[in-house]
């Protein structure tokens, strides 16, 4: 969480951003909130990116003003226009690319004053893992697959029964480059699994952490997946 204050003495407003991560090839949200104003026409929102000459996005007098927008963001950005009046200056970013990573500034002007806050935006690829029993294998084997990750993550297996056990000797992980030559498919196989146990496949890089759980009993198989973005701390 980053909170910024205006720099014009008593005419300052609080602007708050949250560091976030974008999944390449999908929509991203750059979060920013501010002290609301009662008149939409008095609010100006400017998004800037460090190292980029033009603006990322500008919204003023109740509508988008894109005359100064940088070419790399053309047709890829929008604010939530109906939420600006309540203090939401968050930016929607289309088709997130690796090159969108960097430091962004959310700069706000209202009738109460000015304020800004920076936001660190990371980009990569992350996806939910799915764990299945591999019936093709000669022994009881689990297969954990996740379709898109970047940068290359680490994969760790854990089990409820054997807590703290190191499964690196009885697992094998491979990374297969996807067709676009950026992201990779993660496949990890765990051998010699026992019945009536819950196993977890944990995939993690510096952007996200995902877990796929599987509980295997004699009568049923239960699965659960979870993904969490690893937001960087305030600077």
């Amino acid at each position: 969480l980053i909170i910024g204050f205006g720099i014009s003495g008593r005419h300052s407003i609080t602007v708050t951003t949250v560091a976030s991560a974008g999944n390449i090839g999908e929509d991203g949200i750059l979060s920013c909130t501010f002290e609301p104003d009662i008149k939409l026409s008095d609010i100006v929102i400017q998004w800037l990116k460090e190292g980029v000459l033009g603006l990322v996005h500008e919204f003023k007098e109740g509508k988008d003003e894109l005359s100064e927008q940088d070419e790399m963001f053309r047709g890829r950005t929008a604010v939530f226009a109906d939420q600006v009046i309540v203090g939401n200056a968050s930016l929607r970013l289309k088709n997130v690319q690796l090159t969108d990573a960097g430091t962004y500034k959310c700069y706000i002007i209202t009738s109460k004053g000015k304020g800004n806050a920076n936001l660190e935006y990371k980009t990569g690829a992350f996806s939910m893992p799915e764990v299945n029993v591999d019936y093709n294998a000669s022994s009881e084997t689990l297969r954990c697959e996740a379709p898109r990750w970047f940068p290359q993550p680490t994969v760790v297996w854990a089990s409820q029964v054997d807590q703290g056990a190191n499964f690196s000797e009885v697992s094998n992980t491979s990374f297969e480059l996807n067709s676009e030559n950026v992201t990779m498919k993660v496949v990890s196989v765990l051998y010699n699994v026992t019945i009536n146990n819950t196993y977890s496949c944990m995939i993690e890089n510096d952007i996200a952490k995902a877990t796929g759980d599987i509980k295997v009993t004699e009568s049923e198989i239960k699965r659960r997946s979870h993904l969490q973005l690893l937001n960087s701390k305030a600077s």
Epitope: G25, K63, G75, R76, T77, A81, K94, N95
Partner: antibody, heavy 121, light 107 residues
Framework: EVQLVQSGAEVKKPGASVKVSCKAS????????IGWVRQAPGQGLEWIGD????????NYNEKFKGRATLTADTSTSTAYLELSSLRSEDTAVYYC??????????????WGQGTLVTVSS | DIQMTQSPSSLSASVGDRVTITCKAS??????VAWYQQKPGKAPKLLIY???TLQPGVPSRFSGSGSGRDYTLTISSLQPEDFATYYC?????????FGQGTKVEIK
């Protein structure tokens, strides 16, 4: 309600130009991209290009670059497609469509009724 | 430029059938694939966008899925009003591109 109303059918000779209009209502014209798509008789849809009326920014299908010109008149909320050096294979129904997502170029969510352009000597 | 290869080009089906239409992108990956329905003499109608999001007012028998280069439109139980031509659209890149279309006919 979003509405896009296009100009009437046109018959043109090879080598001539045609200008098709698309009048928008029911939303803020300057805040959404407008795309143009054509469909030759019995054929599929072909994307021509799009324009952001709030700034006049355009994108064109390489196939139509230099021959298609997209413009917008914000005072009348009207978008225009002009196609020059017409040939018989340009005979098609030309559609305008609003792109969803405001300044963000989304999918085409609202369409005009289409304008038939016939190129014949 | 990204090309969208749609298949099949036509199919015959009966009311109640499950119908699947696929589109394959020539390169890249993103979720920006939309599906349209078009009936003779009419403008196309948006059914699905962002791979799987149903446009308001579109019946839930229509669904979209896919990732990477492969995308699918499924009609779970074909209704008489669904006989039409369907197109996919790739709108993630600067240049948009339609698939060639799939005509769904009555068997």
């Amino acid at each position: 309600e979003v509405q896009l109303v296009q100009s009437g059918a046109e018959v043109k000779k090879p080598g001539a130009s045609v200008k098709v209009s698309c009048k928008a209502s029911g939303y803020t014209f300057t805040s959404y991209w407008i795309g143009w798509v054509r469909q030759a008789p019995g054929q599929g849809l072909e994307w021509i290009g799009d324009i952001y009326p709030g700034g006049g920014y355009t994108n064109y299908n390489e196939k139509f670059k230099g021959r298609a010109t997209l413009t917008a008149d914000t005072s009348t909320s009207t978008a225009y497609l002009e196609l020059s050096s017409l040939r018989s294979e340009d005979t098609a129904v030309y559609y305008c469509a609003r792109l969803d997502g405001s300044s963000y170029r989304g999918a085409m969510d609202s369409w005009g009724q289409g304008t038939l352009v016939t190129v014949s000597s | 430029d990204i090309q969208m290869t749609q298949s099949p080009s036509s199919l015959s089906a009966s009311v109640g059938d499950r119908v699947t239409i696929t589109c394959k992108a020539s390169q890249g990956f993103n979720k920006y694939v939309a599906w349209y329905q078009q009936k003779p003499g009419k403008a196309p109608k948006l059914l699905i966008y962002y791979t799987s999001t149903l446009q308001p007012g579109v019946p839930s028998r229509f669904s979209g899925s896919g990732s990477g280069r492969d995308y699918t439109l499924t009609i779970s139980s074909l209704q008489p009003e669904d006989f039409a031509t369907y197109y996919c659209l790739q709108y993630g890149n600067l240049l948009y591109a339609f698939g060639q279309g799939t005509k769904v006919e009555i068997k």
